[in-house]
């Protein structure tokens, strides 16, 4: 989570508590276990009829 | 404030082998991906090299140009990034930038160090 | 490999006019969310600078007259009111996949 006071991350970007500062939520797909990660509004789920052809 | 510094440019002959080094300062530099990128006079920019993280097991990738004859190499504990040029050609004559990213876009850029391939 | 095709090669224009620069890459460098596309401006004798990143995101201290747009393989960058220390030369990069490449580059020169 943020750290106490600090401003929010614009959008498409989370804090990093590691960094200590807030990272693009793209690096993700490079760097999917990234603790900024978590926060990160996660992918949308495929369509059915990619889960079920 | 970020700080990346090569050294070890200069002038070699062709078929001669160079190691330049990178000291980073100002960011956590074992978290970040670094790579080599350079610049031929008058030219525009080449990715030559990339070392990834202790996690990655320090995954290396080279471009076709230079595979088999560089290698990208880091030292955590000294915060430094190594490229050790062997059989070197004309060709390779550039200013290399040393350059660090979390991920994908180059945040931080060395001033380069000036590499001459000539007999 | 991904070739990246960047136009024009040089433009001249004045302080105050708006310029705009493209580049195109060989097959798409998007997700239905991001664009691994980004964009540096290199002065003579200095390194490149990180400008713009994932094709839209300003990087920190860069001038709101700098902006970017684009997805898939066509993108877009823009100086709004070009400045005297605007005139540089600009390169886009993709991160899409190994090799990352960069664009020829566009030199702005003065008019």
């Known amino acids: 989570e943020q750290a106490p006071g600090q401003a929010p991350c614009s959008r498409g970007s989370s804090w990093s508590a590691d960094l200590d500062k807030c990272m693009d939520c793209a690096s993700c797909r490079a760097r999917p276990h990234s603790d900024f990660c978590l926060g990160c509004a996660a992918a949308p789920p495929a369509p059915f009829r990619l889960l079920w052809p | 404030q970020v700080e990346l510094v090569e050294s070890g440019g200069g002038l070699v002959q062709p078929g001669g082998s160079l190691r330049l080094s990178c000291a980073a300062s100002g960011f956590t530099f074992s978290s970040y991906w670094m790579s080599w990128v350079r610049q031929a006079p008058g030219k525009g920019l080449e990715w030559v090299a990339e070392?990834?993280?202790?996690?990655?097991?320090?995954?290396?990738h080279y471009a076709e140009s230079v595979k088999g004859r560089f290698t990208i190499s880091r030292d955590d504990s000294k915060n430094s990034l190594y490229l050790q040029m062997n059989s070197l050609r004309a060709e390779d004559t550039a200013v290399y930038y040393c350059t660090g990213y979390y991920a994908d876009a180059m945040d931080y850029w060395g001033q380069g160090t000036l590499v001459t391939v000539s007999s | 490999d991904i070739q990246m095709t960047q136009s024009p090669s040089s433009l001249s224009a004045s302080v105050g006019d708006r310029v705009t620069i493209t580049c195109r890459a060989s097959q798409s460098v998007s997700t239905s969310s991001y664009s691994y596309m980004h964009w540096y401006q290199q002065k003579p004798g200095k390194a490149p600078k990180l400008l713009i990143k994932?094709?839209?995101n300003l990087e920190s201290g860069v001038p709101s007259r700098f902006s970017g747009s684009g997805s898939g393989t066509d993108f877009t960058l823009t100086i709004s009111s070009l400045q005297p220390e605007d005139f540089a030369t600009y390169y886009c990069q993709h991160s899409w996949e190994i090799p990352y490449t960069f664009g020829g580059g566009t030199k702005v020169e003065i008019k």
């Open positions: 070392i990834r993280l202790k996690s990655d097991n320090y995954a290396t």
């Open positions: 994932y094709a839209s």
